[in-house]
């Protein structure tokens, strides 16, 4: 009896082993697709510009490295921001480095006051983990410094040097970002 | 090509009220965050007071916090500013537009000057 137990676990074990490898080929997957699409955005614009010599960002974009960033000059909750974001071709703000969110940090300094501004960054209801926008979890230097005591979705925003949790329904200002174009030779 | 009017402007006195109406031409706004903004004379156009599509939900500037109530009714397409409690410094010409990063052309606002 003892013995069919413990083959019983164990198979229960290997099912739960490769459950957990399919939901990581899952996200995995969900990361490359929306990797892939920022890939194709950017193709897509860098065609385009070929077209026409354009700048590597439009007006009123900051330009840094590879990226684009546009901090918004109005208030949205999270989810409207994110909207916002898409119908310029861009996605709320995806923070892959020290040197990025420094050169953030520096740029709102002189842009605006001490400000809120949404990024792509939310908490997962189930899990309680953060995640970008692509489904990627953020490095741990970049998690938001405090955990909001809201019982609604929580999502992360940038203020001063901080990166900062609130609830997602707040209105705060936001920042977009997206693939600089590559000049035409 | 869409046209927002601003109406419901004029002079008054310090401590009284106004209401402020915006509608558009050609387009419903229904399905757009809405809000208002404000520009006295030689200073910046500023933000005051955002509602979203659905009107459950609406934020506001510190200055006028407490003072204005934005609303909207989308039966009658129209997104209202309710000024109560006004100072001299909110004399200006406020305009209303949809609330997304690109805005429709402004229209000619609505001038509310308060006296003290």
């Known amino acids: 009896k003892l013995l069919q137990v413990s083959t019983i676990a164990m198979q229960q074990q290997e099912k739960l082993i490769q459950q957990e490898r399919a939901l990581l080929n899952f996200t995995e997957w969900k990361r490359s697709c929306a990797l892939q699409m920022k890939y194709c955005q950017a193709f897509m614009q860098n065609s385009l510009s070929s077209a026409h010599n354009s700048s590597p960002c439009p007006n009123n974009w900051i330009q840094n490295r590879e990226s684009c960033y546009y901090v918004s000059e109005i208030w949205s909750i999270w989810h409207t921001s994110q909207e916002n974001c898409l119908k310029e071709g861009s996605t709320l703000l995806q923070i892959e480095s020290k040197e990025e969110m420094d050169f953030i940090t520096g740029s709102l300094r002189k842009i605006k006051g001490s400000y809120d501004y949404w990024v792509g960054l939310s908490q997962d209801g189930h899990s309680g983990r953060w995640l970008w926008q692509d489904g990627s979890s953020p490095s741990p230097g970049l998690l938001p410094a405090e955990r909001s005591q809201s019982a609604n979705q929580v999502c992360g925003y940038v203020k001063s040097n901080s990166l900062l949790s609130s609830n997602c329904s707040t209105w705060k200002y936001f920042i977009c970002e997206k693939y600089a174009l590559r000049s035409s030779v | 090509q869409v046209q927002l009017v601003e109406s419901g402007g004029g002079l008054v006195q310090a401590g009284d009220s106004l209401r402020l109406s915006c509608t558009a031409s050609?387009?419903?706004?229904?399905?757009?965050?809405m809000a208002w903004w404000r520009q006295a004379p030689g200073k910046e156009r500023e933000y005051v007071a955002v509602?979203?599509?659905?009107?459950?939900?609406?934020h506001y500037s510190d200055f006028v916090k407490g003072r204005f109530t934005i609303s909207r009714d989308n039966a009658k397409n129209t997104v209202s500013l309710q000024m109560d409690s006004l100072k001299p410094e909110d004399t200006a010409s406020y305009y209303c537009?949809?609330?997304?990063?690109?805005?429709?052309?402004w229209g000619q606002g609505t001038q509310v000057t308060v006296s003290s």
């Open positions: 050609e387009r419903n706004l229904r399905s757009y965050d």
């Open positions: 509602i979203t599509s659905s009107g459950d939900s609406t």
């Open positions: 537009n949809v609330n997304a990063i690109r805005q429709w052309p």
